[in-house]
């Protein structure tokens, strides 16, 4: 019987060009975490395996960093990064727990103001 629950950072927003930390936490279970997958829609971003450690997918290695903890740091954000992110905890003996985070990447206020005013 799966008794655990996943707590996430929920719906979050960040500015274009900035960075954000995606965090999930598994609680209320004594199950052993064997691997955590981070996915964006259907794309694998990163894996943290209990034995093999971290692996960032090659297509994201320049913009994704492991941690803090089992979380994931996204850098140099673009508007295209807006969307759903999933932390998938593989545990023994419980099985799989999934948490969802929605990230909205906003145009920065600096960029907005910069577009409105011209330097004479």
């Amino acid at each position: 019987m799966m008794t655990g629950t996943i707590e996430t950072t929920g719906n979050i927003s960040a500015e274009k060009g900035g960075s954000i930390i995606l965090q999930c936490h598994l609680s209320s279970t004594t199950a052993q975490v064997t691997q955590v997958n981070w996915e964006q829609q259907d794309q694998l971003l990163a894996i943290c395996n209990a034995d093999l450690g971290w692996h960032i997918s090659p297509s994201f290695k320049d913009r994704v960093a492991p941690g803090p903890g089992l979380g994931l740091t996204l850098q140099s954000l673009t508007v295209n990064d807006t969307g759903e992110y999933f932390c998938i905890y593989h545990t023994y003996p419980d099985g799989t727990y999934t948490g969802r985070i929605f990230l909205e990447v906003l145009e920065s206020s600096v960029a907005e103001h910069g577009a409105r005013f011209q330097i004479p």
């Epitope: 894996i47 395996n49 034995d51 093999l52 450690g53 971290w54 692996h55 960032i56 090659p58 960093a65 492991p66 941690g67």
Partner: nanobody
Framework: EVQLVESGGGLVQAGGSLRLSCAAS????????MGWFRQAPGKERELVAA????????YYADSVKGRFTISADNAKNTVYLQMNSLKPEDTAVYYC????????????????????WGQGTQVTVSS
């Protein structure tokens, strides 16, 4: 950039022991994850054992658990693989590899993340 040179391979009878050494130059190993891989003829290269530069984490393939021991001597900038109770199926070319893909305290023992490789040393176990 780190350069790796393996030594200690050879021919040994089943049940015997060998100690492989991997000497590094060009950088200090303490900031790397180090791995010993092996490749037998006609087979894919596989991770046998790995250790973080700090020595705080180790990994062993199921096939060598209890028989092989990986260790690091940061003062000598050398990683060792002590191989006991050798079996004919341990026959392969053994490679030392290093990576520092992610900063401390994060590490990777994933095959694709090892950036630096030695030339390999042959281990042959006869029955």
């Amino acid at each position: 950039e780190v350069q790796l040179v393996e030594s200690g391979g050879g021919l040994v009878q089943a049940g015997g022991s060998l100690r492989l050494s991997c000497a590094a130059s060009g950088s200090t190993l303490s900031s790397y994850a180090m791995g010993w891989f092996r490749q037998a003829p006609g087979k894919e290269r596989e991770l046998v054992a790995a250790i973080t530069g700090s020595g705080g984490r180790t990994y062993y393939a199921d096939s060598v658990k209890g028989r092989f021991t990986i260790s690091a001597d940061n003062a000598k900038n050398t990683v060792y693989l002590q191989m006991n109770s050798l079996k004919p199926e341990d026959t392969a070319v053994y490679y030392c590899a290093a990576n520092r893909r992610y900063s401390f305290p994060y590490w990777s023992f994933w095959y694709d993340d090892f950036d630096y490789w030695g030339q390999g040393t042959q281990v042959t176990v006869s029955s």
